[in-house]
Interface confidence: medium
């Protein structure tokens, strides 16, 4: 176009700039080895480094792995982002007792109100549960489960919140009162797929690096990329997303070109020894619990978590023999893989059936 | 299955270049960064750098900068790696790797040996 | 850069003999640590990736564990095959970084 004739001109003589004809303006050639961050930089500030999905530029412009929720007591809050760690919270039903960076160190379930109590403030992810006491005229028997949860036999103490993972506890010494409260939150994750679709599809351009038009000729690639399977962290660093490819971990949330991917233990399993955005092992969950009633879900969380029969009508735990036998799966859609080691260390209850997968493992299935 | 396939060793005298390739096979070539990874004569590994191959996007170790450059050839399916300015502190034998969706340096060329020698 | 500080250099082991590598990051790798296995004239062999997930084919003596800024491989009971030396390294952030290896050679 004539008209465009002199905008065009502005940018001649001028190697820091290009005119850039769909957009019909000048643009800041960004440096090589740096991407633009819009179809038409105006400035340097315009341009950055790229790292691999999974990874995320730093503050100090180094390609750095996002933090993975994989732990099977985190999610995910917010993603992993082109500069910007991803950040993990406590699951429904828990909250953190010993924060870390852009995560949860620990993470306790919720106190439950105990008999005459009611619930004021339902915990968080932030803040365990409040509870006050229940108005005159209410049955201790409490009929409503939303206002009054009464504790079933061998549920957790009251007074005090029950971590998840330990800092110090072996599989063999992770406590197994609250079988119920256990048993109610690995039912709950049966209302997620086990699996999420991996992030790492391997595309062959990085959507959220890539510019909307390629670089001009001649100028060489604009900003910073990352391999798959990294982020480019706050400082423009390429860093590891976290893996869950073991067989105990599945993906919380994807590994992005600016985040790291977070791993949790699969449904059925508690994280024994946490990682950031991961977890270090998983041991299954010390399920005593036969049969749960469906709770209303939760203000403040999506999942849905169950409530635990009347009093009295919890079942004794029994371990399974020591050699692993135990009855066939008869529900194979929905199988949580356990780890074998774990497995000998922590019982797993006959009330949750438990078979052996091709691998060797036990797989305990959720029916 | 996945193979990286390099180039022969070479000799080369001080001052000289050297370009050593690394032909892929069994995978889409431009759907994974190429690594490239020296290892002196008795010495540990140290990461060069490494490439996009879908769009010859480069990122380099600070020490190789002004040492090494990547590029990658698609319709071959071959990436190379240039070494300028040879000196003898440059011999060494030269490894290209890919990585695997979660995996580090899952797959590795058989490696290249350079030598300078005056 | 991270760097990654592995020891010993050198152990001399017997065949049966469980032995431990380890390797120090000069800042928290969040897991992010490989553990490879190198004998003269081949290329390294992936045996450990984030800390403690074993590599395809790897056989289970071989374990991995470690957060933070500390990282072991274990081998339970060193076998004639694995006498080679061993690398760590950490990739949590570019550029990449190995340990300097450890030999494992025969008492």
């Known amino acids: 176009f004539p008209q465009d004739r002199p905008f065009e001109d502005t940018c001649h003589g001028n190697p820091s700039h290009y005119y850039d004809k769909a957009v019909r303006r000048c643009c800041y050639r960004c440096p090589m080895g740096l991407f633009p961050t819009q179809q038409c930089p105006q400035r340097p500030t315009d341009c950055r480094k790229q790292c691999e999905p999974d990874y995320y530029l730093d503050e100090a412009d180094r390609c750095t792995a996002c933090v993975t929720c994989s732990r099977d007591d985190l999610v995910e809050k917010t993603p992993c982002a082109w500069n910007s760690s991803r950040v993990c919270e406590c699951r429904p039903g828990m909250f953190c007792s010993t924060s870390a960076v852009n995560s949860c160190a620990r993470c306790f379930f919720h106190s439950v109100c105990p008999a005459g109590m009611i619930v004021k403030f339902p915990g968080t992810a932030q803040k365990n549960t409040v509870c006050e006491p229940a108005s005159p005229g209410v049955s201790p028997a409490c009929a409503s489960p939303e206002n009054c949860k009464e504790p079933s036999s061998g549920t957790i103490p009251q007074a005090k919140p029950t971590p998840v993972s330990p800092a110090t506890s072996s599989a063999s010494t992770m406590p197994v009162r609250g079988g119920t409260r256990l048993a109610q939150e690995a039912a709950s994750k049966l209302t997620r797929a086990p699996d999420s679709p991996s992030s790492v599809g391997r595309p062959s351009s990085d959507p959220g690096l890539s510019p909307t038009q390629p670089c001009p000729e001649g100028s060489g690639d604009c900003r910073k990329q990352c391999e798959p399977d990294y982020y480019l962290d706050e400082a423009g660093r390429c860093t590891a997303c976290v893996s869950c490819s073991r067989d105990d971990l599945v993906e919380k949330t994807p590994c992005a070109w600016n985040s790291s991917r977070t791993c949790e233990c699969r449904p059925g399993m508690i994280c024994a020894t946490s990682a950031t955005n991961s977890c270090a092992r998983c041991v299954p969950y010390p399920i005593c619990a036969a049969e749960t009633v469906t709770k209303p879900q939760d203000m403040a969380e999506k999942d849905t978590t169950f409530e635990a029969p009347p009093l009295g009508t919890q079942p004794d735990c029994n371990p399974t023999p020591e050699n692993g036998e135990a009855p066939a799966s008869t529900s194979p859609t929905q199988s949580l893989l356990v780890d074998s080691q774990a497995s000998k260390t922590l019982p797993i209850p006959t009330s949750a059936p438990v078979a052996l997968s091709s691998t060797g493992k036990p797989v305990l299935d959720a029916g | 299955q996945v193979q990286l396939v390099q180039s022969g060793a070479e000799v080369k005298k001080p001052g000289a270049s050297v370009k050593v390739s690394c032909k892929a096979s069994?995978?889409?070539?431009?759907?994974?960064?190429i690594h490239w990874i020296k290892q002196a004569p008795g010495q540990g590994l140290e990461w060069i750098g490494y490439?996009?191959?879908?769009?010859?996007?480069?990122d380099y170790n600070q020490n190789f900068k002004d040492k090494a450059t990547l590029t990658a050839d698609k319709s071959s399916s071959t990436a190379y790696m240039e070494l300028s300015s040879l000196r003898s502190e440059d011999t060494a034998v030269y490894y290209c790797?890919?990585?695997?969706?979660?995996?580090?340096?899952?797959?590795w060329g058989q490696g290249t040996l350079v030598t300078v020698s005056s | 850069d991270i760097v990654m500080t592995q020891s010993p250099s050198s152990l001399s082991a017997s065949v049966g003999d469980r032995v431990t590598i380890t390797c120090k990051a000069s800042q928290d790798v969040s897991t992010a640590v490989a553990w490879y296995q190198q004998k003269p004239g081949q290329s390294p062999k992936l045996l450990i990736y984030w800390a403690s997930t074993r590599h395809t084919g790897v056989p289970d003596r071989f374990t991995g564990s470690g957060s933070g800024t500390d990282y072991t491989l274990t081998i339970s009971s060193l076998q004639p095959e694995d006498f080679a030396t061993y690398y760590c390294?950490?990739?949590?952030?570019?550029?990449?970084?190995f340990g300097g290896g450890t030999k494992v050679e025969i008492k």
């Open positions: 790797a890919r990585r695997e969706d979660y995996v580090p340096f899952a797959y």
């Open positions: 490439i996009n191959p879908s769009s010859s996007y480069t």
């Open positions: 390294q950490q990739h949590y952030r570019i550029p990449h970084t």
């Open positions: 069994g995978y889409t070539f431009t759907s994974y960064w």
